[in-house]
Each structure stands twice: as C-alpha cells, then as structure tokens.
C-alpha cells in the first residue's frame, strides 16, 4: 500500500527569487513554496522564478552565469558550484512539524536560516540555498 | 537540538569548500545574537553534480 507522491522539486531560496524544477501550489500565508515531497525529487537549476503572488510564478530560463578558469566544486554547465552543509542548532528542539514546510515552526526557521545565509555570503557569488532538511540532533 | 542539512549554490569559481566553512564559522556568534540560533558541529562538503536531493543526505544520521 502506498501513499501518493507529489512531483515537486526543491526551491532555491534567495532574496525573494527562486530557481526550481517544477512549480507547486503555495499558500498565500507563506513566504516559501510548499512542496509536498520536496526531498524526494532531484533538484535542478532549471528555471528562474520571481514570486509575485503565492499562486502565480513567472518563469524565464536561467541566464548563463559567469564562470572562471578554475573550478572549486563540481559544477553545472551554467557555472554553478554546490556545497552540502550540515550544522546543529543546539538551543532549538526538534519536533515533527519541522518535517512539514506548511507549519509555522518550519517556515520561521527556514526564514531565519535563509536570511542568515544571505548575511554570511553577501559578498557576491551566492545564489541561494535549497534542499533544506531538519532532523533531530 | 535540530540538525539542519541544506545545499548552497554559488557562482562557479567564487568560493571553495574551505571558505564556505570559514565564513560560516565566523558568523556563528552573530547568528546567536541576531537570530537566537546557537550553531555547532558545522560540516561542509562538495556536492557532485548531477545530484539528487537524496544523495547528499546520507552522511549524517
């Protein structure tokens, strides 16, 4: 017996814009799209979306990014490097709502983390974050 | 505690693994005061491409 899987992809969150493979309906009350199974599907930098309204997303193709002569990480042909990052937040408690992007706890934590990374890597070159996953420490 | 796992994207050639980790670690104190997030056990690695959402979550259980 199996449940139903939703074919949506992870969102690359960056400063109000997002790049994602497939669109998914989002609630008007949330700052991020709400993929049902955002962790189940591959993420590709397939489109560049600017969120104007929770239910409408405008798309254009990703413009080619400037690439340098040496590589620092495996890249896309568009000139993007990806890094996997893991860390503990010791003063927060995990609970099951952190498995669901429609919950307040998930959204607040994702918002803080997204803002934090924009602050840390604001010197340029940072495109955003995706595939965010929370689990108990 | 909560473990956070995510993927960061940068323009090619603008940063390496060491600098990603260094800059993140340098910000930990400010993260605690600004966002009330006490961060520890930072780990950064390259993500091979093409990658899937599943493939890079296996190291940390």
């Amino acid at each position: 017996a199996s449940g139903s899987a939703s074919g949506s992809a992870s969102t690359l969150v960056h400063n109000g814009t997002s790049a994602r493979a497939t669109t998914t309906p989002a609630s008007k009350s949330t700052p991020f799209s709400i993929p049902s199974h955002h962790s189940d599907t591959p993420t590709t930098l397939a489109s560049h979306s600017t969120k104007t309204d929770a239910s409408s997303t405008h798309h254009s193709s990703v413009p080619p990014l400037t690439s340098s002569n040496h590589s620092t990480s495996p890249q896309l042909s568009t000139g993007v490097s990806f890094f996997f990052l893991s860390f503990h937040i010791s003063n927060l408690q995990f609970n099951s709502s952190l498995e669901d992007p429609s919950t307040d706890y998930y959204q607040e934590l994702q918002r803080d983390i997204s803002e934090m990374f924009l602050q840390i890597y604001k010197q340029g070159g940072f495109l955003g974050l995706s595939n965010i996953k929370f689990r108990p420490g | 505690s909560v473990v956070v796992q995510l993927t960061l994207a940068f323009r090619e050639g603008t940063i390496n693994v060491h600098d990603v980790e260094t800059q993140f670690n340098q910000y930990k104190t400010e993260a605690a005061s600004r966002y009330n997030l006490t961060i520890s056990d930072v780990s950064v690695s390259d993500v091979p491409f093409p990658f899937s959402a599943q493939s890079h979550h296996h190291h940390h259980h």
């Epitope: 199996s2 449940g3 139903s4 899987a5 939703s6 949506s8 309906p25 609630s27 009350s29 949330t30 709400i34 993929p35 049902s36 199974h37 955002h38 962790s39 189940d40 995990f94 609970n95 099951s96 709502s97 498995e99 669901d100 992007p101 429609s102 919950t103 307040d104 996953k133 689990r135 108990p136 | 899937s52 599943q54 493939s55 979550h57 296996h58 259980h61």
Partner: antibody
Framework: EVQLVQSGAEVVKPGASVKMSCKTS????????INWVRQRPGQGLEWIGY????????EYNEKFKGRVTLTSDTSASTAYMELSSLRSEDTAVYYC??????????WGQGTLVTVSS | DIQLTQSPSSLSASVGDRVTITCRAS??????LNWLQQEPGGAIKRLIY???SLDSGVPKRFSGSRSGSDYTLTISSLQPEDFATYYC?????????FGGGTKVEIK
C-alpha cells in the same frame, strides 16, 4: 514507488502486549518520521504518536503515554509500535504513515489487532 | 486539543455531482490541514496537503480551500471510485487530530 508494508493481523488476550511493524521501501532517505494512527471498528481516526526513524525522538498522544512504545531500526527501514496492557477497546486497525517532505504523505495498509479472551 | 468538526457525517450523491465537505477548526491552524480518502476496504490515501495543494496522481476534480477557520474539500464531478470516507487532519499542534469523517455514498 514508496511503499509501507505493515505486519499481519494479531489476536491477543486482554492484559497482554502486541508489537507491530511498518517497513518502508522505494525511498532512498533513511531519515524521516513515522506517525501511528488507529481506527476502532466503525470509528474515526486517532493519532497515537510519532517517531523519527533512526533516532530516539518520539512524540506521544497523552492518551497513550505509558502504554505505547515507538522504536525503529534504520538498517531495516522499519518502525515498530508496541502497545501494552491491552483491553477490548484497543481492538482496532493500526496504521503507520510516513513523511516525504511533508507529514502523513504515505500510508500503510493497516494491521488489525483484536483483543479477545 | 484542537477539535475538527467535520460535516456532513454522510451524504448521498450521484456520479457527476459536485460534492463539498467542510471541516471547522476550534483554533487557528493556519494551512496545516490535510484531506484523506479511506476506501471501503480500509486503504488510506492523502489527497490534499497544506489546505489546498493536490498530491500527485490525485485527479484535478479534487480541490481544497479555506475561509477563516472553515476548510473545504470539493469534488467537482463525483466519479464511481470516489465513493469512500473522507477525513480532515490537522497537524498544527500535537496531538494531531482528525475530523469525524464524511461517508460519501451512492444515491
């Protein structure tokens, strides 16, 4: 395709315990949550608790605290629920439901537990 | 605990009919509400997550919406395979709770 396969039906005596399993397949993550829900004959659904597979993190409905134990075996991609001090009103179908980017995404077929002397 | 009051508890309808099922939440739950379908044999499937998002593989005749504390599941044109029992589920706060169910029967 994600599948959740639950263990077979059980007939148990009042006062005894029962342990059932929920095996997941078709999914490469080894870390996700499993919720347990029950449905008594002719009744609605009732949440029992939650476990994050591969950790000792659990949440329980107060109504079942002390009688329910949730455990998991990451290597076998299996979650377990043990219910003790069984009484006739525990006769029900017990479902597991796992997360997949959001809660209650996939459901098992259910395990019928009959408490009878 | 958050109470979900689901109505009607049962309804009779014909193939092609538009069917509406409502859940009212006793507290604010935002959009943290799912709709589930339970077939007569017992199998449970999620249809709608986060109030209005359709799970993949679920026909587009199913839709979810919200107005204040009222959450609605609509089946725009009932099909033979839709005769089942439907439940709402809130996951805003523990313990997670379900509506009492709506049995959709053939008229």
């Amino acid at each position: 395709e994600v599948q959740l396969v639950q263990s077979g039906a059980e007939v148990v005596k009042p006062g005894a315990s029962v342990k059932m399993s929920c095996k997941t397949s078709g999914y490469t993550f080894t870390s996700y949550g499993i919720n347990w829900v029950r449905q008594r004959p002719g009744q609605g659904l009732e949440w029992i608790g939650y476990i994050y597979l591969g950790s000792d993190y659990t949440e329980y409905n107060e109504k079942f605290k002390g009688r329910v134990t949730l455990t998991s075996d990451t290597s076998a991609s299996t979650a377990y629920m043990e219910l003790s001090s069984l009484r006739s009103e525990d006769t029900a179908v017990y479902y597991c439901a796992r997360s997949g980017g959001s809660l209650f995404a996939y459901w098992g077929q259910g395990t019928l537990v009959t408490v009878s002397s | 605990d958050i109470q979900l009051t689901q109505s009607p508890s049962s309804l009779s309808a014909s193939v092609g009919d538009r069917v509406t099922i409502t859940c009212r939440a006793s507290q604010d739950i935002g959009i943290t509400l799912n709709w589930l379908q339970q077939e007569p044999g017992g199998a449970i499937k999620r249809l709608i997550y986060a109030t209005s998002s359709l799970d993949s593989g679920v026909p587009k005749r199913f839709s979810g919406s919200r107005s204040g504390s009222d959450y609605t599941l609509t089946i725009s044109s009932l099909q033979p395979e839709d005769f089942a029992t439907y439940y709402c589920l809130q996951y805003a706060s523990s313990p997670y709770t379900f509506g009492g169910g709506t049995k959709v029967e053939i008229k």
